[in-house]
């Protein structure tokens, strides 16, 4: 029984490689999947000496290890690319690294949108 999952319909979208892949650089992505399959949001990034380099954000297909995650939290110690996924609209806006070995928790907030 999949009880009480947050339905994911839209995610924050970002692609650092947007020019090469001929996509938008950022925005919102409406998630589309097969009937009866769950959808998630994800974020991926690199951390070069404390400098965060966002790689991609968007929708993520049904993945059991993403079920019931309300927040986007990466736990791998020191990967080449950090990854997290979550359930709920725009849940990938913020993302966190909380290493399993008990290092410091680091949360990455999106930059505030400039006033128009």
């Amino acid at each position: 029984s999949g009880r009480g999952e947050a339905e994911t319909r839209e995610c924050i979208y970002y692609n650092a490689n947007w020019e090469l892949e001929r996509t938008n650089q950022s925005g919102l992505e409406r998630c589309e999947g097969e009937q009866d399959k769950r959808l998630h949001c994800y974020a991926s990034w690199r951390n070069s000496s404390g400098t965060i380099e966002l790689v991609k954000k968007g929708c993520w297909l049904d993945d059991f290890n993403c079920y019931d995650r309300q927040e986007c939290v990466a736990t791998e110690e020191n990967p080449q690319v950090y990854f997290c996924c979550c359930e709920g609209n725009f849940c990938n806006e913020r993302f966190t690294h909380l290493p399993e070995a008990g290092g410091p928790e680091v949360t990455y907030e999106p930059p505030p949108t400039a006033p128009t």
């Epitope: 999952e5 009866d36 399959k37 059991f64 736990t75």
Partner: antibody, heavy 118, light 110 residues
Amino acid sequence: EVQLLESGGGLVQPGGSLRLSCAASGFTFRNDAMSWVRQAPGKGLEWVSGISVTGGSTFYTDSVKGRFTVSRDNSRNTLYLQMNSLRAEDTAVYYCAKVYYTSFFDYWGQGTLVTVSS
Amino acid sequence: QTVVTQEPSFSVSPGGTVTLTCGFNSGSVSTSYYPSWYQQTPGQAPRTLIYNTNTRSSGVPDRFSGSILGNKAALTITGAQADDESDYYCVLYMGSGIWVFGGGTKLTVL
């Protein structure tokens, strides 16, 4: 080092019950989904059940629905499988497995043997 | 009911190449099913070889590779060795918390 250690198997009569446990160490248990997979003697692997990181979502193969219940205690780093109304066809080695992103089983326990026989 | 099919048995000569396949009765296997492959020797727990179609698990030799061939997932072993003689299982994640294992392939190296 990731370790998964199953226990609780044994000989039980048809209609009886058993509770299997899987003690996890070497990783942060609460951060990963878990699953049970079984293997009848001389047969192939069969997925039995899965449970999400919080325990809020549980799933079963059709043949055990209504008889088996999967649960987890994240404070004790332990996964459970409560097996009721056992049948001869449930005789198998039961493995617990850690689930990682892209829904694969990245670590396996050594298994515990459940024998259902009168 | 979904049935995942594998060749029941396969033989390969030492140093040869073999491709095991994994299909199912409800259509084509694609990357969205996150195909994964496991090796098992008698009396042992399964060992993870390939996940997410084509990613080798840590410590797995590069003679093992995964792919999609036509409408099936495939595991290719190049330069087969005697200790590759094992049972090989594919698994498809069907979504909604459900996995289905193939029946397994018994690989003989002779």
